[in-house]
Interface confidence: medium
């Protein structure tokens, strides 16, 4: 039989009598920076180097008895969860082990910042093939260790860190609260949020994606065929970095953006019980539990987007919330979400020549978040259109009117503290799929973008009735780019995409009469790349 | 015992090269700032991360640190560098008291500081 | 269909030393490390050593350092086990078997029919 | 070094009877233990491994229990291929050998 964790990242077409995926990652090397561990356990022996690299603070403690099977035992055990021979994801990686952890489990942020440091040295010195840096450790919000973690990432390398135990926010860890690090949650066996005794998996929107991290068979340091079960959030994190192995084995010319998307779009979706998670984080946490792709290759001919949800604004009147996209995303659209209803909108700008998603809040607002539709979308140029506020009743409105540029997104934007109180909301002409139609006091923008072959549709859904929630999904073969709701609706939440569904949230239904303003109507553009879709069939 | 005696060392070489006050002020406007861990059980007060602007070179952040540890001498601090960071950050790792975070934010090149703080097993 | 086929059995002369083989099918055969077990008649069974066929490693029962000696040829999916300096008390049924991983934790799941050797005079 | 001790070393018994082996280690063994039977003439075959999870293929009225020092095989109605010797098996990690239990036959009364 297989163990429950390696058959929930298993596609059904792997899954036989033995968890024996083809090319177990054998051109990737993982580093690992942890405890000591035991190289020659069977399910790891001949797999591990053991770097000469150790820097790690004194143990707690004058009584402290100092017994190498304990002192092994976290960095052993997620050495054989990521690339153990019986138990392990990626069966084919070698890894290299760095201590940076002593035998307590606790290290320092300037001996991590050292260990990177050599990572990206032996690197420089004798370069390999992809790398794969596993950081199964957690500490306060720390700039300095974000930034080194964002060089090493820049310099192509993946990083793949515990989101942390604390049942907290991951943001206000490091390194899981930096951007360009893959952060991974943990769930159980019921696809539940792992409790760990008081505490449990940190959740949010630092938090990439969710992996198995409970009760998890792997290596034990007490002797060279034991095994353990351990949870957390490292085990967690092994379980993507033997993930991102594979496919980096299968694709090794794979950036970290492309296998950050592939490793959300292969991701079970909406499996994890929100309920667990704090009220205000529900939204922000990504419902998504790690799996391999149903095959290594031919994933190329999909257009892959993911949501980034921004800080929140803070509660003042002026504030501001940015969301960003990767270095090479694009920013496909825009929007916002404020829990009181309290906002002014949303618009895209240029900052340091790229663009960035800014949500603003409104007088009274206890402020807002901005959501970013971030693709990967090659030879891309995008740009944004913006039309001001309108005088005629009509409302405002904008297209893409260059040839060949074609509309992703929509957003509105507007000055004045309560828009569209009391006025009946504005349709959009039918068979304009090119416009955005916003409120006549709101500026409106509009993403437009070219790339080979690409080809968008807009998607409705109104409801009539009050309603707390109205989606709208794309079909099939097209991705969500663009999510936002139908101007004219005063009491509308916000708009955000989850995955590939459109998502626009009104007040509590109760606190609103069933007139015409309770109609809601949710707009998703729906993209795809017929560019992509033809590279990748001239490929087979 | 030889460890010490090397730093020993640089420290009297820094001493006599370095003139007291700042040779290269910070450019206008733009201050350091100076970081440490919300959680104050997992703070390492005492040790240092000196990040510096990051365009600056190897022998800049070297001489950053000797000239950090001459204006702490004359003060009659003693500090060590334990590290230079060269390949992804340009800074430094140094042990010194508190008292000097003032001085070291003035110095040329720096752009923030960060108190050590702990990192723990998931 | 897992299968393990000892041979190399026989009377061999005291002091005398022989080689005996195991050839396994139905498996990756260096996925799995395999043993060595003796069982002397009417005795219990006794472990010789092991091998790891995936990088030749080996490890031995102290009591037979020196006197076994465990290889493999991964190209025929074969083990092997050289015993020297062969005495009386060496007389024994000698069985391979293949150490399976069952979610946690090791056993021997399939053995070989096993091969008599007979060290007398 | 680690001692497996099994007990009996014999014992007669009825088709339908309930039968108890143990096993006791030395020192503790967690729950690394295996059972294995053998008739005369043929190989050992796998029963229990991990001191409690029964290997496929064999019958239910087979159940080990049992951690750290202290094990037991039992066959809950004894049938007639079930008459054979049992060795419990676990593996000495300070010295890094296997060690096998003397064994107990299990004889028709």
């Known amino acids: 039989s297989i163990p429950w964790n390696l058959e929930r990242i298993t596609p059904p077409r792997y899954r036989a009598d033995e968890y024996q995926p083809p090319d177990g990652g054998s051109l990737v090397e993982v580093y690992l920076l942890d405890t000591s561990i035991q190289s020659d356990h069977r399910e790891i022996e001949g797999r591990v180097m053991v770097t000469d690299f150790e820097n790690v603070p004194e143990e707690d403690g004058t009584r402290f008895h100092r017994q190498a099977s304990k002192c092994d035992s976290h960095g052993t055990h997620l050495a054989g969860v990521v690339s153990g021979r019986d138990a392990g994801v990626a069966k084919g990686a070698s890894m290299r082990s760095l201590r940076v952890l002593n035998c307590q489990g606790k290290g320092t942020v300037s001996g991590t910042l050292i260990g990177l440091e050599f990572i990206r040295k032996s690197q420089l010195v004798q370069p390999v093939g992809p790398l794969v840096v596993l950081l199964p450790l957690a500490g306060g919000y720390s700039r300095v260790l974000n930034a080194a973690c964002q060089r090493l990432a820049r310099a192509g390398v993946v990083l793949v860190t515990a989101a942390g135990n604390f049942r907290d926010d991951a943001c206000l860890y490091s390194p899981a609260s930096a951007p360009e690090v893959i952060t991974v949650g943990a769930t159980n066996a019921q696809d539940q949020p792992v409790t760990l005794g008081t505490l449990g998996t940190n959740f949010g929107r630092c938090v990439d994606l969710f992996a198995p991290g409970e009760d998890i068979i792997g290596a034990s340091s007490d002797c060279s065929t034991c095994f353990v079960s351990q949870s957390g959030t490292s085990q967690a994190a092994a379980h993507v970095a033997g993930i991102a192995a594979m496919m980096l084995s299968a694709e090794p010319e794979l950036t970290l953006a492309e296998l950050r998307q592939r490793l959300i779009h292969f991701s079970a979706k909406d499996v994890i019980n929100e309920a667990w998670f704090p009220e205000d984080q529900r939204v922000l946490t990504p419902n998504l539990v790690a799996a391999l792709p149903p095959s290594t290759h031919g994933a190329g001919w999909q257009l892959f987007c993911r949501t980034v949800w921004s800080a929140h604004s803070g509660p003042t009147r002026m504030a501001t919330a940015v969301a960003r996209c990767a270095p090479d995303e694009e920013l496909l659209s825009c929007s916002s979400f404020s829990r009181s209803g309290k906002r002014r909108g949303e618009r895209m700008e240029a900052q340091g020549g790229k663009l960035v998603c800014r949500a603003h809040n409104a007088f009274g607002g206890e402020g807002v978040y901005a959501i970013a539709r971030c693709c990967l979308l090659p030879q891309a140029n995008c740009s944004v259109h913006t039309a001001p506020p309108a005088e005629a009743s009509m409302g405002t409105r904008v297209h893409c009117h260059q040839q060949g540029h074609v509309l992703t997104g929509c957003s509105s934007h507007w000055e004045v503290e309560d828009l569209g109180t009391h006025k009946p909301p504005v349709l959009r002409p039918r068979g304009q799929p090119n416009q955005c139609v916003g409120h006549r006091e709101a500026s409106i923008h509009a993403s437009c973008c070219h790339a080979p072959g690409l080809e968008c549709k807009v998607k409705e859904h109104g409801i009539p009735a009050p309603q707390e929630q109205v989606t709208v999904a794309c079909e099939e073969g097209w991705t969500l780019t663009g999510c936002s709701a139908l101007p004219g609706t005063s009491h509308v939440l916000g708009a955000y995409a989850v995955d590939n569904t459109c998502v626009v949230r009104s007040r509590d239904v109760s606190t609103t009469g069933s007139t015409s303003e309770g109609a809601v109507t949710a707009v998703a553009i729906c993209c795809r790349s017929r560019h992509l879709a033809q590279a990748s069939q001239e490929l087979q | 015992q030889e460890d010490e005696d090397g730093d020993y060392e640089e420290l009297v070489l820094a001493l006599r090269s370095e003139e007291d006050g700042l040779a290269e002020a910070p450019e206008h406007g733009t201050t350091a700032t100076f970081h440490r861990c919300a959680k104050d059980p997992w703070r390492l007060p005492g040790t240092y991360v000196v990040v510096l602007k990051e365009e600056t070179h190897l022998s800049q952040s070297e001489r950053t640190a000797r000239r950090l540890q001459a204006q702490a001498a004359r003060r009659g601090y003693l500090t060590k560098i334990l590290h230079v960071f060269h390949g992804l950050l340009p800074g430094f790792l140094v042990k010194m008291s508190g008292d000097l975070l003032e001085l070291a934010l003035k110095l040329p090149h720096v752009d923030y500081i960060e108190e050590d703080s702990s990192v723990f097993a998931q | 269909e897992v299968q393990l086929l000892e041979s190399g059995g026989g009377l061999v002369q005291p002091g005398g030393s022989l080689r005996l083989s195991c050839k396994a099918s139905g498996y990756t055969f260096s996925s799995y490390w395999m043993h060595w077990v003796r069982q002397a008649p009417g005795k219990g069974l006794e472990w010789i050593g092991r091998?790891?066929?995936?990088?030749?490693?080996?490890k031995y029962n102290e009591k037979f350092k020196g006197k076994a000696t465990i290889s493999r040829d991964n190209s025929k999916n074969t083990l092997y086990l050289q015993m020297n300096s062969l005495r009386a008390e060496d007389t024994a049924v000698y069985y391979c078997?293949?150490?399976?991983?069952?979610?946690?934790?090791?056993?021997?799941?399939?053995w070989g029919q096993g091969t008599l050797v007979t060290v007398s005079s | 070094d680690i001692q497996m001790t099994q007990s009996p070393s014999s014992l007669s018994a009825s088709v339908g009877d309930r039968v108890t082996i143990t096993c006791r280690a030395s020192?503790?063994?967690?729950?690394?233990l295996n059972w294995y039977q053998q008739k005369p003439g043929k190989a050992p075959k796998l029963l229990i491994y991990a001191a409690s999870s029964l290997q496929s293929g064999v019958p239910s009225r087979f159940s080990g229990s049992g951690s750290g020092t202290d094990f037991t095989l039992t066959i809950s109605s004894l049938q007639p291929e079930d008459f054979a010797t049992y060795y419990c098996?676990?593996?000495?990690?300070?010295?890094?050998?296997?060690?096998f239990g003397g064994g107990t036959k299990v004889e028709i009364k």
């Open positions: 091998i790891d066929p995936y990088n030749g490693g080996t």
């Open positions: 098996e676990s593996y000495d990690y300070s010295l890094g050998r296997y060690v």
């Open positions: 020192q503790a063994i967690s729950k690394y």
């Open positions: 078997a293949r150490y399976g991983y069952y979610l946690g934790s090791y056993a021997m799941d399939y």
